[in-house]
């Protein structure tokens, strides 16, 4: 049975040119994280395998950084990484936990980080 | 549970459009991708594209754009995909699936033959 | 687009028998590969994502492996429900491009 929960950033913003941290969390099971993907909706971002290490996607090579921890850094930011991004981690027993974080690049200099919420 | 349901098949004429629909129930219709792709006998499986009813956004495969038009309709949690200009290469069984991100196709249609035929 | 290459078209195997099939992909696509089954006159039906995580409710005898470009899809005891074509895909970037397939055959 799947107990976990996914804690995420929730919905953020970011200026323009600035850098945002991606963050998830897994919390309220004992299941070995064994990949974490990054994703939006049809492209893959970034892998994180416990015998692997981290792959990037070559498309995302130059402005995105692994970490801290299982996050993902995306720098550059451009209005066109305005979207969804997903955090997918895979867990024995328990099996996949899903996050999501909606980002918004703002031209102006007003971006403020959003609440943090949780998907169970 | 997880069902979707596509139209029946179609017999067409060369040069007409069809437009073949994907009834999905059981799950948010707006939380994930569907995505079409065809199989022509005894051949292989070849990706279409996709629409996201969230917020109604496709991505097409180079090869069919002009040649497949993919729509949603949210009230009725149902996919659409219309072919036109229709020849005997567009005869094939064209399939409706749900994408969950990382983890693949995990639900299908039970696929729509389409048969263009003068 | 990326290429995915399953080397045989048709594999002739014995119920109780270990098969695996072989699939490569044009470029490293990391882990993001998934196996689905085809039955004559259904639906693909995905086993494996990822790579090597079982999809809810496959039995544990269909498993699979690989990262990079070599990928491969295991059925450690055969059964004569597994007469198939299987295909493999890469989920890693659009458009998604799947193998050619490999029809299982029981002798």
């Known amino acids: 049975m799947m107990t976990g929960t996914i804690e995420t950033t929730g919905n953020i913003s970011a200026e323009k040119g600035g850098s945002i941290i991606l963050q998830c969390h897994l919390s309220s099971t004992t299941a070995q994280v064994t990949q974490v993907n990054w994703e939006q909706q049809d492209q893959l971002l970034a892998i994180c395998n416990a015998d692997l290490g981290w792959h990037i996607s070559p498309s995302f090579k130059d402005r995105v950084a692994p970490g801290p921890g299982l996050g993902l850094t995306l720098q550059s930011l451009t209005v066109n990484d305005t979207g969804e991004y997903f955090c997918i981690y895979h867990t024995y027993p328990d099996g996949t936990y899903t996050g999501r974080i909606f980002l918004e690049v703002l031209e102006s200099s007003v971006a403020e980080h959003g609440a943090r919420f949780q998907i169970p | 549970q997880v069902q979707l349901q596509q139209s029946d098949a179609e017999l067409v004429k060369p040069g007409a459009s069809v437009k073949i629909s994907c009834k999905v129930s059981?799950?948010?219709?707006?939380?994930?991708?569907i995505h079409w792709m065809k199989q022509r006998p005894e051949q292989g499986l070849e990706w279409i594209g996709y629409?996201?009813?969230?917020?109604?956004?496709?991505k097409y495969n180079e090869k069919f754009k002009g040649k497949a038009t993919l729509t949603a309709d949210k009230s009725s949690s149902t996919a659409y995909m219309q072919l036109n200009s229709l020849t005997s290469e567009d005869s094939a069984v064209y399939f409706c699936?749900?994408?969950?991100?990382?983890?693949?196709?995990?639900?299908w249609g039970q696929g729509t033959s389409v048969t263009v035929s003068s | 687009d990326i290429v995915m290459t399953q080397s045989h078209k048709f594999m002739s195997t014995s119920v109780g028998d270990r098969v695996s099939i072989t699939c490569k992909a044009s470029?490293?696509?990391?882990?993001?590969v998934a196996w689905y089954q085809q039955k004559p006159g259904q639906s693909p039906k995905l086993l494996i994502y990822?790579?090597?995580y079982r999809y809810t409710g496959v039995p544990d005898r269909f498993t699979g492996s690989g990262s990079g470009t070599d990928f491969t899809f295991t059925i450690s005891s055969v059964q004569a429900e597994d007469l198939a074509v299987y295909y493999c895909?890469?989920?890693?970037?659009?458009?998604?491009?799947f193998g050619g397939g490999t029809k299982l055959e029981i002798k």
């Open positions: 699936a749900r994408r969950v991100v990382a983890s693949g196709m995990d639900y």
């Open positions: 059981g799950y948010t219709f707006t939380d994930h991708t």
């Open positions: 629409i996201y009813p969230r917020d109604g956004s496709t």
């Open positions: 470029q490293d696509v990391s882990t993001a």
């Open positions: 990822s790579a090597s």
């Open positions: 895909q890469q989920h890693y970037s659009t458009p998604y491009t």
